[in-house]
């Protein structure tokens, strides 16, 4: 289409140049290149009312270059497109378009969420997560021992982030109530201030005991709750040091 | 959804003649350079003719120049290829693509064999 | 015109491999350059263009390189739907010009 534009234009005009500036292999005062040196590429170019033939070494923006024959020429990119391979193919869009198989759309398909950093439509990606961890010990204020009711907790890791329209992820970290093992804490887990805690707590109990008689020896549930698991320990406790005081008569003061 | 249709290719003598058609649909026909790829028996490809989307120029490989005629009716979103004097070189698969660089869309192919 | 000469014409490889087929240009095509697969009884697909550039829905399995003469295409990881000939294609001149082809087959 240019080149036989150039022809004519040639025909038309007495004045076509061989001395021609930019890249042009021959020219006119009116048009400007008419045809190209080698490996350039020719575009028009719209100045006012008049196109102007331009030699270019490759396309501006939103042209791309395809060579034939008879002239290197620069074609445009479809309307919303920026840059472009061929009319099949955009790979970058224009402000406001997302690309997407090479296309320009104004909203993303179904199944597929814009991307505002790459102007690109992509897949909805959905968070992941692994699978849980087995529990942690059961432990009170950091030690697993003492007969106290406890906490165990589990994680989990993210292995796939979501995406902005993507399910979101789940919680990585999981705690429950427990009992914790139940053994003596070694002196070394022992603090005055939990000594002194346990000794006011054990003489309470023990005024409780005075007043209540209750020996559970009844049935029990196979599957106990934590609540239950602990009642059931503190009563135990109760009988054995209720059964100690009658043997010593001496006040206990201290937890072995 | 692009889609080219060739049809016309069957047997025929050399030396006669035989006019293949594409008919496109699914993209803008009158936007788009067409051009016509063979492929003979077993063998690679090849370039035959391309016609740029305004029908205003055509090119030709060298060994069909003069013998084949590549043209459009871009009103009928169809692509043609008249061959004259058919040589049996010219036996081979005919595919109609678009040709903006690379040849993005094919046709199926029409088989042309040129035997006597 | 510019030859397009392609190498191995036929090669043999396993599942899971990684292949590479080559193509030289007699001369330099900058990176006007092209592949193509054609599956047995099917038309050709574009599969790269501008040596490296996948078409869209093509697996990164395949990649292409070079500039110049010298290009190749590389196919990781070997599967059985990449059974086909390929087929490199240059358009930095005119008459556009093919290789003769590479008939990849499972071992």
């Known amino acids: 289409q240019n080149a036989s534009r150039g022809r004519r234009q040639r025909r038309m005009h007495p004045n076509v140049s061989q001395g021609c500036q930019g890249g042009c292999a021959t020219c006119s005062d009116y048009n400007g290149c008419l045809s190209c040196k080698p490996r350039l590429f020719f575009v028009l170019e719209r100045i006012g009312m008049k196109q102007i033939g331009v030699c270019l070494s490759s396309c501006p923006s939103g042209y791309y270059g395809t060579r034939y024959p008879d002239i290197n020429k620069c074609t445009k990119c479809k309307v919303d497109c920026d840059t472009c391979f061929n009319k099949n193919f955009c790979t970058k869009c224009k402000s406001g378009f997302y690309l997407h198989l090479g296309k320009c759309l104004d909203s993303c398909p179904e199944g597929l969420e814009a991307n505002n950093h790459t102007m690109e439509c992509v897949s909805i990606v959905h968070c992941e997560a692994s699978e849980w961890s087995p529990w942690s010990p059961c432990m009170k204020k950091g030690k697993t021992c003492g007969f106290k009711r406890g906490t165990e907790t589990r994680v989990r890791d993210i292995l796939q982030h979501p995406s902005a329209k993507g399910n979101l992820c789940p919680p990585t970290s999981e705690t429950r109530t427990c009992i914790v093992q139940r053994k003596k804490c070694s002196k070394g887990e022992r603090g005055k201030k939990g000594r002194e805690r346990k000794r006011k707590k054990l003489n309470k109990e023990e005024r409780k005991e005075t007043s209540s008689s209750s020996d559970s020896k009844g049935l029990e549930s196979s599957i106990e709750t934590p609540d239950q698991q602990e009642n059931k320990e503190r009563q135990q406790q109760q009988k054995r040091r209720a059964r100690d005081k009658q043997q010593k008569s001496v006040s206990v003061s201290t937890v072995h | 959804e692009v889609q080219l249709v060739e049809s016309g290719g069957g047997l025929v003598q050399p030396g006669r003649s035989l006019k293949l058609s594409c008919a496109a649909s699914?993209?803008?026909?009158?936007?788009?350079?067409m051009a016509w790829v063979r492929q003979a028996p077993k063998k690679g490809l090849e370039w035959v003719a391309t016609?740029?989307?305004?029908?205003?120029?055509?090119y030709y490989r060298d060994s069909v120049k003069g013998r084949f005629t590549i043209s459009r009716a871009n009103a009928k979103s169809t692509l043609y290829l008249q061959m004259d004097s058919l040589r049996s070189e010219d036996t081979a698969t005919y595919y109609c693509?678009?040709?903006?660089?690379?040849?993005?869309?094919w046709g199926q192919g029409v088989m042309v064999t040129v035997s006597s | 015109d510019i030859q397009m000469t392609q190498s191995p014409a036929s090669l043999s490889a396993s599942l899971g491999e990684t292949v590479t087929i080559e193509c030289r240009a007699s001369?330099?095509?900058?990176?006007?350059l092209a592949w193509y697969q054609q599956k047995p009884g099917n038309s050709p697909q574009l599969l790269i263009y501008?040596?490296?550039s996948l078409i869209h829905g093509v697996p990164s399995r395949f990649s292409g390189s070079g500039s110049g003469t010298q290009f190749s295409l590389k196919i990781n990881n070997l599967q059985s739907e990449d059974v086909a000939s390929y087929f490199c294609?240059?358009?930095?001149?005119?008459?556009?010009?093919f290789g003769a082809g590479t008939k990849l087959e499972l071992k």
């Open positions: 501008d040596v490296n």
């Open positions: 693509a678009t040709h903006d660089k690379t040849f993005d869309y």
């Open positions: 699914g993209f803008t026909f009158s936007d788009y350079d």
């Open positions: 016609i740029i989307y305004d029908g205003s120029r055509t």
């Open positions: 001369e330099d095509i900058y990176s006007d």
């Open positions: 294609q240059q358009y930095d001149n005119y008459p556009n010009t």
